[in-house]
Interface confidence: low
């Protein structure tokens, strides 16, 4: 592989690494969305919530003169409850909505697939760099692109999940905004998907320059 190509691959791998860090951050944190009630009756406190793929946290926040609840960064009594994805017999204390649970299970499962693809891609990259097997960069690039797509699907499932929660008559929350974990997931998708495509492009053998050349005649990769 030529020096310029190697440099391009390294830059792409750095972008992919940033994508991996962002994807990991998004998966393990629970600030995908912040939900707040619109209190029609004057209360001294209100209950806002933020949630991720694995749990929902509610926080009792002091109310101001307006009817808005928050921001969630205000100090308050916090109570977190895990979505019990893997023990269907039990329902979560806070989350008793079956449709919502299905959404969070889907998003979490797809995120796990994404992490699986990231691991496979990283193994391919490590083997490629260690043993100079440049051809392994091609499957690695595909794995990263697939990981990015899985993150995108997770993001969309979470968007639907938030919409269902807000529209449901069985939650107190009416207003919402997407938070930093969601932004991390979106950025991870862009970096992994585009990085994967770029890596695929840079790791492919050089196309023949002349009509009489075949791919086999092209200069070797190393």
């Amino acid at each position: 592989m030529s020096q310029t190509k190697m440099l391009k691959v390294r830059v792409t791998l750095f972008c992919i690494l940033a994508g991996i860090v962002l994807a990991m951050t998004a998966v393990v944190t629970d600030h995908w969305a912040v939900l707040s009630p619109h209190m029609e009756h004057h209360n001294t406190t209100c209950e806002a919530a933020h949630f991720g793929l694995w749990r929902i946290c509610t926080k009792r926040i002091p109310m101001d003169d307006s009817k808005t609840c928050g921001p969630i960064t205000l100090p308050g009594e916090k109570n977190c409850s895990y979505f019990r994805h893997f023990n269907p017999g039990e329902s979560s204390e806070i989350f008793e909505f079956t449709t919502q649970k299905e959404y969070s299970i889907s998003a979490a499962a797809i995120a796990i697939f994404s992490l699986g693809f990231i691991i496979l891609g990283s193994l391919c990259v490590l083997l490629s760099l260690g043993k100079k097997r440049d051809y392994l960069l091609r499957p690695a690039s595909m794995f990263y692109a697939f990981a990015g797509l899985c993150i995108l699907v997770s993001v969309e499932v979470m968007r639907q999940s938030v919409k269902r929660m807000i529209d449901s008559e069985d939650t107190v929350w009416i207003e919402y905004y997407y938070s930093w974990s969601f932004a991390c997931a979106c950025a991870a998708f862009i970096l992994l998907f585009l990085g994967g495509l770029a890596l695929l492009l840079f790791s492919l053998p050089r196309m023949p320059r002349n009509p009489w050349e075949s791919c086999m005649d092209a200069e070797p990769e190393h």
Epitope: P37, H41, N43, T45, C46, R60, K67, E169, V172
Partner: antibody, heavy 125, light 110 residues
Framework: EVQLLESGGGLAQPGGSLRLSCAAS????????MSWVRQAPGKGLEWVSS????????YYAASVKGRFTVSRDNSKKTLYLQMNSLRAEDTAVYYC??????????????????WGQGTTVTVSA | QSVLTQPPSASGTPGQRVAISCSGS????????LYWYQQIPGTTPKLLIY???QRPSGVPDRFSASKSGTSASLAISGLRSGDEADYYC???????????FGTGTKVTVL
Amino acid sequence: EVQLLESGGGLAQPGGSLRLSCAASGFTFSSYAMSWVRQAPGKGLEWVSSVSGSGGTTYYAASVKGRFTVSRDNSKKTLYLQMNSLRAEDTAVYYCGKGGYCSSSGCRHYGMDVWGQGTTVTVSA
Amino acid sequence: QSVLTQPPSASGTPGQRVAISCSGSNSNIGNNYLYWYQQIPGTTPKLLIYRNNQRPSGVPDRFSASKSGTSASLAISGLRSGDEADYYCAAWDDSLSGYVFGTGTKVTVL
């Protein structure tokens, strides 16, 4: 199926008392605000009272404050309206309505999505 | 005396569009969600619109609502004979700490 069934209406004398009940079924009663609304003959709807899911917060219309008491027994899935010092103007059909979802810090809204069939209260000498 | 004012009556021929207004103040419509109820003669009221413009499942999309400042309106398009009813707007009122209904509008299909 979500259902509300009122009872306890009837004839009462001015200054007398009546206790209305509203039996709920088909939903998690303790998670919802409940309300009483009345309609005098040939007149429009008038909100009477509301109570939060836990029963801890109650609201009353100015016309009934101090005379009517709203309460609920979540174990029996029943809403009550104790009416004392009844007046002729309290004559109406009384409806109970299922309100918005309640969390520990407040209720979502008081739009009534399910109504009972109503019970008639007549206050006359 | 209701704090939400509605016209006493509205009418239209089948297929026509009818609009009902509801006027209030900052303490009710201006600062809270608005609801619309339909009461067909001899029946119990039914929630038609919640949270300003949302329709509960089962309510046809011929019914639509909007809110602007301290007033609101309910529109019925493609009027049918089955739409003959009394329509009430309602909202929470902060100053009264209570729920207030509009005066009601009787819709007649000619």
